[in-house]
């Protein structure tokens, strides 16, 4: 056959679907690789062809669209499973072609089993809610296109294994799950099960996501430098090791980049000739507030080093702060025989 633009195996789109549930999978060509959509391609006389390679096989084979009850079908640029079976797992290819043009891409599809509490190897999306922020909602994801708007599905929400049905601070409202006030105790996995009829059959869609309750923007503050501070003086003799921690607290801020850095005499450590090392550690609170510690270390400090200015800087979306460490050279202890004796007038 003539040359085909092969986009290879698109592992970025590792599609996971639950066993025995409907799945609709759009050909990724139109989503991510080509500059035109399916309608344009179809109007131009291009045909979309599907085939697949079973798990642990090398042989590409056509998809059987003649299964009982049209279990697998194609509609425009969508491949439908009504429903999936475990052995549908494999690499699927969609190819767009006519006599003069050809483009194709493959993607992995994994059919996943779940237990009665919705536990499975499925990678779960994480939804962050602000703590004690007021009303926030999550919406049952990825159910568009499965049934027409005229069909009214029933939706059941679960936290972990348990159906949510009491009027506590988390309230199911159809496709939405409303958190009247999000608390740390609301952290966990939430599942919506959407049940809808189609051609005399009943289908279920199961969608699980992880809720993580994080710090509220109402409580967010600029970075707070706990160390260095005015109460600690780093007093060293030449030749000793100088260790100065810079410890900074950052409020959780969605999509904020938290930065901590040292300057020595106004320059980044990389830009000066001192033999300095910096080690960073990061810890998080339950609401994802962050504490970053950068320890500046000079193994054998010189008297010149002890005269330099050491400043810790921190920046987040809330602002930028800086604090200088108090560094000084230790005055050598007097040698008794000479200094003290002279002090007492001994000759």
């Amino acid at each position: 056959s003539e040359r085909c633009d092969d986009w290879g195996l698109d592992t970025m789109r590792q599609i996971q679907v639950f066993e025995d549930e409907p799945a609709r999978i759009k050909c990724p060509l139109f989503e991510h690789f080509l500059k035109f959509n399916y309608s344009t391609a179809h109007s131009a006389g291009l045909t979309l062809i599907w085939y697949w390679t079973r798990q642990d096989r090398d042989l590409e084979e056509p998809i059987n669209f003649r299964l009982p009850e049209n279990r697998i079908s194609k509609e425009k640029d969508v491949l439908w499973f009504r429903p999936t079976l475990l052995n549908d797992t494999g690499n699927y290819t969609c190819m767009l072609r006519n006599t003069t043009y050809c483009s194709k891409v493959a993607f992995p599809l994994e059919v996943v089993q779940k237990d009665s509490c919705f536990n499975s190897p499925m990678k779960l999306p994480v939804h962050k809610l602000y703590i004690e922020y007021g009303i926030q909602r999550i919406t049952c994801p990825n159910v568009d296109g499965y049934f027409p708007s005229s069909v009214k599905p029933t939706i059941t929400w679960y936290m972990g294994c348990y159906k949510i049905q009491n009027f506590n601070n988390v309230i199911p409202e159809g496709m939405n799950l409303s958190f009247l006030i999000a608390l740390i105790s609301n952290n966990g996995n939430y599942t919506c099960v959407v049940t809808y009829p189609e051609n005399g059959r009943t289908f279920h869609l199961t969608r699980t996501l992880t809720v993580k309750v994080v710090g509220s923007p109402k409580n967010a503050v600029p970075p707070v430098i706990h160390s260095p501070n005015d109460h600690v003086v780093y007093e060293k003799e030449p030749g000793e090791e100088l260790l100065i921690p810079c410890t900074v607290y950052f409020s959780f801020l969605m999509d904020s980049r938290n930065e901590v850095w040292w300057t020595i005499d106004g320059k980044k450590p990389d830009d000066i000739t001192i033999d300095v090392t910096i080690n960073e550690s990061i810890s998080h609170s339950r609401t994802e507030d962050e504490t970053r510690t950068q320890i500046l270390s000079i193994k054998k400090v010189t008297s010149e080093d002890l005269k330099r200015s050491y400043v810790c800087h921190a920046r987040s979306a809330k602002g930028e702060v800086a604090k200088a460490a108090k560094v000084k050279q230790k005055v050598p202890a007097p040698r008794y025989t000479v200094e003290l004796a002279c002090g007492f007038g001994a000759t």
Epitope: G134, I155, F167, I171, L180
Partner: antibody, heavy 118, light 111 residues
């Protein structure tokens, strides 16, 4: 189309109980909550409580706690509101109303007038 | 005494614009969504606005809602005689227990 049909007007003596019914049709009964709201003559709206027809769980306004009971019968798509120890200030139109908690109450019954008089 | 405060009455001429305010606190309006209802004389209330500013299907765009801080506002433009009714704001509060709250109602008179 969504319909909430309530039982007829009631006249009760102080100290008695009243049970108002609300039959739902035109939608999946267990997919929406049912509120009960009352309106005394010439007054505003007062929320009494809510029932989840799916599991039967309830939440009552503090003011009515201990005096009100909301129940449902899924086989007939009907909810009930019983108010006990009636007093004259309970004279009002009682509405059942379908809706969620955070996005409004979208369909209301026609109302049931309960008169408490000795 | 309602938890949400509305003016008892407002009036305007046909074709005019009118606003009805609803004042609450951080524990109700401040943190939550507001709905608005219209109650024509002798009828059950009807939902006009939910989620602060969304209209159910069938509600004309002459009706609008907004929220700022602990107050909400219902706006009606191109006033018509059939708009003469009582209007109620509604939200909820949750402090370990759910409580749906209504404003005291505002009587709109079309002059």
């Amino acid at each position: 189309q969504v319909q909430l049909v309530q039982s007829g007007a009631e006249v009760k003596k102080p100290g008695a109980s009243v049970k108002v019914s609300c039959k739902a049709s035109g939608y999946t009964f267990t997919s929406y909550y049912m509120h009960w709201v009352r309106q005394a003559p010439g007054q505003g709206l007062e929320w009494m409580g809510i029932i989840n027809p799916s599991g039967g769980s309830t939440s009552y306004a503090q003011k009515f706690q201990g005096r009100v009971t909301m129940t449902r019968d899924t086989s007939t798509s009907t909810v009930y509101m019983e108010l006990s120890s009636l007093r004259s200030e309970d004279t009002a139109v009682y509405y059942c109303a379908r809706g969620f908690v955070t996005s409004g109450i979208d369909y209301w019954g026609q109302g049931t007038l309960v008169t408490v008089s000795s | 005494q309602s938890v949400l405060t509305q003016p008892p009455s407002v009036s305007a001429a046909p074709g005019q614009k009118v606003t009805i305010s609803c004042s609450g606190s951080s524990s109700n309006i401040g943190n939550n969504y507001v709905s608005w209802y219209q109650q024509l004389p002798g009828t059950a209330p009807k939902l006009l606005i939910y989620d602060n500013n969304k209209r159910p299907s069938g509600i004309p765009d002459r009706f609008s809602g907004s929220k700022s801080g602990t107050s909400a506002t219902l706006g009606i433009t191109g006033l018509q005689t059939e708009d003469e009714a009582d209007y109620y704001c509604q939200t909820w509060t949750y402090t370990g227990r759910l409580w749906i709250v209504f404003g005291g109602g505002t009587k709109l008179t079309v002059l």
